[in-house]
C-alpha cells in the first residue's frame, strides 16, 4: 500500500474551487522529489496536469497550482473555476507518474442544486448585504408586494409592503418600491446570517395574475485564505469589509479550540498580551478597510484568524468577516537573531537586524513600537541618514555586516529606552522583525569623560577606558553624524605586551584633536568591534569655545524634545505633518537631512533569546 494519503472522493459544484491536500512521509528524499497531480485516462496512463517543477497543462492554465510544504510532508493542489469536464479519476503522487508513490482521488463536479426555472442565484458572504430584485407587471403595481422564504413545502412571509417584518429579520431588512414607471421592487437584507440561506419567492399581487420570481440565496462563510509565512518573519492581514461598516469598530481574532474567537487586537484598544510589541493595526481608510501586521512570527501563532466589524469589537453572528488560515514555516529563510537585547543604564546596545539579502540596496529603518490604541511605530533612524532629533548623538544605523544583516547602535541608554523596536526595509515586508531592549543593573564597560569643552586652536585628548575583556577587540573613535559615525585616527596607549597582560593602567584608547577647530564640535563615540560586528560604544559631546583669559565654561548640548516632522510606521509608513501616507515598499518622497560621513561605530550587549549569549551573525 502507498504511504501517500489524501481524499478518496472530492465533490463540488461548477464554478467552485477545490483545494486537495496530499500527505506523504517527510523523509529527506520525499521532501525534495517531484510532486504531481495527474488525470487517469482510458488507456490507464496518467497525464500530468500540474507539478511542483512548475509545469501546468494548458487545460489548467491560470486556474491551478501545486504547492509543496516539505516541513510538514504535504502538498496542496488548488483548482479553480471547476467545470463538469473536470469530473474524473486523478492521482496525487511523488516521483514519476507511472511508478512511484501515489494516491487515487475521484473528483466529481456537479451542476449544483436543481432550482425552479428562472431562479436568480445570489451568492453573498455572511454579514454582507444582498439586494433581491423582484420584477412585476403594470397591473400589479398598486398591489401588495411581498418576499417569502420557502421552508420545505411551506412559504414563510419575510416582509411585505404593508409593513410586516418577520422577527428573524428585524432591523436588517427593507422593501423598496420605486416611483412610477419602474416595474421592479427590491428587498435589501443587511448583516446576512448563515440561517438566511435558502430559496425565496418574490410576489406582487395575488390570485392567478400575481407575479412571482424565485431567488436562491447562498450565504457563505468566507473561505479562509491560506497564508504561509516564515518563522520569525511578518504577516499582514488586509481586511476589507465594505462601506456599510466603515464607522463600526474593527477587530482581528483567532479561532480557538472551542470554535469561539479570541480578540487579538481591536480598534477599541484591546490587545492580546501574546502579541505585545509585535502587532500594529493600521488606521482604516475611508472605505473601512484596515490591515494588521504581526511580526516575530512564532509556531504558536498558527491558526485561523478572522477580521470583522462590530460595535463591541468582537465577533458577532451576522456581521461581515474575512478569514485566513496562517501556517508558520519552521524551515525559515529568516535567520535567528536575538529577540531580547540587554543593556545597562548609561551603556549601549547593538541590534542585528535581518533583511532579505536579495535586497541589499533597499532602504533600512528602525522604529519604536508604541502600544497606545492600535499601536504605531515612529521611525527613529533610516539608512539615508535621518535620525529623530531626540536621538541625536546616540543612534546610528550601519549597513554592516551586510549580506542580509544591518546593525543599529543606541547608546547613552536610560530606562526610557526599554521597549520593543522593529527592524524593517522598504523591500520585502515579510522580513520585519521585532527586538526588545531591556535595561538591566550594571555599569557601562567603556568609560569616557562627561561632556568636554575644547579650546579653539589647542590640543584636546579624550581618553576611553576599557576592561581587559576587550583587549582583543579592535578599538576605535568616530565622529557621529546623522549619516553614521566617521572613524578617526586614535591610539592605544601602552606597549602591546601591556594589553596581552592586561595591565590595569594600560587599558586606554585616546582621541587627539590637534588643533581644535569649530568643525570639531559635536558627538564622538569610543567603541569596540570584532570585524564587522560592533561591540559597546560610549559617547562624549565636545563643545568648542574661544580661548579665555581665565575660567572655563562647561558646555552641554540641549537635547531636543520630540521631532515635529515624525515618520510613523503603521502597516505602511506614514509621515505626520500632512505628508502623504506611504507604503513601506515605496517611500517615494523621503525627507533626508543632507550630511556626509562614512558609517561606523557600534555596541554589543548581552543578549537573550532564551540565553544571554552575545548577539552573533555572519560577516560578509
Amino acid at each position: 500500500k502507498s504511504p501517500v494519503f489524501g481524499p478518496q472522493e472530492v465533490s463540488s459544484v461548477e464554478g467552485n474551487s477545490v483545494s486537495i491536500k496530499c500527505y506523504y512521509p517527510p523523509t529527506s528524499v520525499n521532501r525534495h522529489t517531484r510532486k504531481y497531480w495527474c488525470r487517469k485516462g482510458a488507456s490507464g496512463r496518467c497525464i500530468t496536469l500540474v507539478s511542483s517543477e512548475g509545469y501546468v497543462s494548458s487545460n489548467y492554465a491560470g486556474r491551478a497550482n501545486l504547492t509543496n510544504f516539505p516541513e510538514n510532508g504535504t502538498f496542496v493542489v488548488n483548482i479553480a473555476q471547476l467545470s463538469r469536464d473536470d469530473s474524473g479519476h486523478y492521482k496525487c503522487g511523488l516521483g514519476i507518474n507511472s511508478r512511484g508513490l501515489s494516491f487515487d482521488v475521484s473528483l466529481e463536479v456537479s451542476q449544483g442544486p436543481e432550482l425552479p426555472n428562472g431562479t436568480e442565484v445570489y451568492t453573498v458572504d455572511v454579514g454582507r448585504t444582498v439586494t433581491i430584485k423582484c420584477p412585476f407587471k403594470t397591473e400589479n403595481a398598486p398591489k401588495t408586494k411581498a418576499l417569502y422564504k420557502k421552508i420545505g413545502q411551506t412559504s414563510v412571509l419575510v416582509i411585505d409592503s404593508r409593513n410586516y417584518v418577520n422577527p428573524n429579520y428585524k432591523d436588517r431588512i427593507r422593501l423598496r418600491i420605486p416611483g412610477t414607471g419602474q416595474l421592479i421592487f427590491t428587498v435589501v437584507i443587511d448583516r446576512l446570517r448563515l440561517s438566511d440561506h435558502g430559496l425565496y419567492l418574490c410576489q406582487a399581487g395575488d390570485g392567478s395574475n400575481r407575479d412571482e420570481k424565485n431567488a436562491d440565496l447562498q450565504v457563505l462563510e468566507p473561505e479562509p485564505e491560506l497564508v504561509y509565512e516564515d518563522l520569525r518573519g511578518s504577516v499582514t492581514f488586509h481586511c476589507a469589509l465594505g462601506l456599510e461598516v466603515a464607522n463600526v469598530a474593527k477587530f482581528l481574532c483567532r479561532v480557538n479550540s472551542r470554535e469561539t474567537c479570541d480578540v487579538v487586537i481591536n480598534t477599541l484598544g484591546k490587545r492580546d498580551s501574546a502579541f505585545e510589541g509585535r502587532i500594529l493595526l493600521n488606521p482604516q481608510d475611508k472605505d473601512g478597510s484596515f490591515s494588521v501586521v504581526i511580526t516575530g512570527l512564532r509556531k504558536e501563532d498558527e491558526g485561523r484568524y478572522l477580521c470583522g466589524a462590530h460595535s463591541d469589537g468582537q465577533l458577532q453572528e451576522g456581521w461581515p468577516i474575512q478569514a485566513w488560515q496562517l501556517f508558520v514555516n519552521e524551515e525559515s529563510t529568516i535567520p535567528r537573531s536575538p529577540t531580547v537585547v540587554k543593556g545597562v543604564a548609561g551603556g549601549s546596545v547593538a541590534v542585528l537586524c535581518p533583511y532579505n539579502p536579495k535586497e541589499s540596496q533597499s532602504l533600512k529603518y528602525w522604529c519604536l513600537w508604541e502600544g497606545a490604541q492600535n499601536g504605531r511605530c515612529p521611525l527613529l533612524v533610516e539608512s539615508q541618514g535621518l535620525v529623530q532629533e531626540q536621538y541625536e548623538g546616540r543612534l546610528s544605523l550601519l549597513q554592516e555586516p551586510g549580506n542580509g544583516t544591518f546593525t543599529v547602535i543606541l547608546n547613552q541608554l536610560t530606562t526610557q529606552d526599554a521597549g520593543f523596536y522593529w527592524c524593517l526595509t522598504n523591500g520585502d515586508t515579510r522580513w520585519r522583525t521585532t527586538v526588545e531592549i531591556k535595561i538591566i543593573e550594571g555599569e557601562p564597560n567603556l568609560k569616557v569623560p562627561g561632556n568636554v569643552t575644547a579650546v579653539l586652536g589647542e590640543t584636546l585628548n579624550i581618553p576611553c577606558h576599557f576592561p581587559c575583556k576587550f583587549s582583543s577587540y579592535e578599538k576605535y573613535w568616530c565622529k557621529w553624524s546623522n549619516t553614521g559615525c566617521q572613524t578617526l585616527p586614535s591610539q592605544d596607549e601602552g606597549p602591546s605586551e601591556a594589553f596581552v597582560n592586561c595591565d590595569e593602567n594600560s587599558r586606554l584608547v585616546s582621541l587627539t584633536l590637534n588643533p581644535v577647530t569649530r568643525a570639531d564640535e559635536g558627538w564622538y563615540w569610543c567603541g569596540v568591534k570584532q570585524g564587522h560586528f560592533y561591540g559597546e560604544t560610549a559617547a562624549v559631546y565636545v563643545a568648542v569655545e574661544e580661548k579665555k583669559v581665565a575660567g572655563s565654561r562647561y558646555v552641554s548640548p540641549a537635547k531636543a524634545d520630540a521631532a515635529p516632522d515624525e515618520k510613523v510606521l503603521d502597516s505602511g509608513v506614514r509621515e505626520i505633518e500632512n505628508k502623504a501616507i506611504q507604503d513601506p515598499r515605496l517611500f517615494a518622497e523621503e525627507k533626508v537631512v543632507a550630511d556626509t560621513g562614512d558609517q561606523a561605530g557600534g555596541s554589543r550587549a548581552s543578549v537573550d533569546s532564551s540565553s544571554s549569549e552575545e548577539q552573533g551573525g555572519s560577516s560578509k
Partner: nanobody
Framework: EVQLVESGGGLVQTGGSLRLSCAAS????????MGWFRQAPGKEPERDFV?????????????YYADSVKGRFTISRDNAKNTVYLQMNTLKPEDTAVYYC?????????????????WGQGTQVTVSS
C-alpha cells in the same frame, strides 16, 4: 461549545450493514471536519482512524477513508440536520469496536485523533460471525 452525539450502533452479523449517525449541536464554523474513529476491544487508549469528511461552504466535500474500510464504508453529511453519517456495509468481525465521532479543524490531517477538538461518547458496534 460543540456537542456531538452518536447513535446507530448495535449487533449485526458478518456481511450485514449499519448506519451510524453523529448529530452536532452548538456553533461550528462552516469550514469544518468531522471524522469517525474506532477503538477495538482491549486496544485502549488507541483510537484508529476510520473515515473523515471535510467541507467548506456546504458545497465542496472531501472524503477520506482508512484502507481497511475503503469500498465498504461511506461517510456523508446532511447539512440541514448538521449530522454526519457512516454507512457501514459488508461488515466483518474485525470491525467490532466502539465507534467515536469527532469534530475538528478543517485544515488538519484528518487521520490524527489529536487534531480533533470535540468527541462524542461513542457507540458500540459488534459484528458476530
Amino acid at each position: 461549545e460543540v456537542q456531538l452525539v452518536e447513535s446507530g450502533g448495535g449487533l449485526v452479523q458478518t456481511g450485514g450493514s449499519l448506519r451510524l449517525s453523529c448529530a452536532a449541536s452548538g456553533r461550528t464554523f462552516s469550514s469544518y471536519a468531522m471524522g469517525w474513529f474506532r477503538q477495538a476491544p482491549g486496544k485502549e487508549p488507541e483510537r484508529d482512524f476510520v473515515a473523515a469528511l471535510r467541507w467548506s461552504n456546504d458545497r465542496t466535500y472531501y472524503k477520506y477513508y482508512a484502507d481497511s474500510v475503503k469500498g465498504r464504508f461511506t461517510i456523508s453529511r446532511d447539512n440541514a440536520k448538521n449530522t454526519v453519517y457512516l454507512q457501514m456495509n459488508t461488515l466483518k468481525p474485525e470491525d467490532t469496536a466502539v465507534y467515536y465521532c469527532a469534530g475538528g479543524n478543517y485544515f488538519s490531517d484528518p487521520r490524527v485523533d489529536k487534531e480533533y477538538n470535540y468527541w462524542g461518547q461513542g457507540t458500540q458496534v459488534t459484528v458476530s460471525s
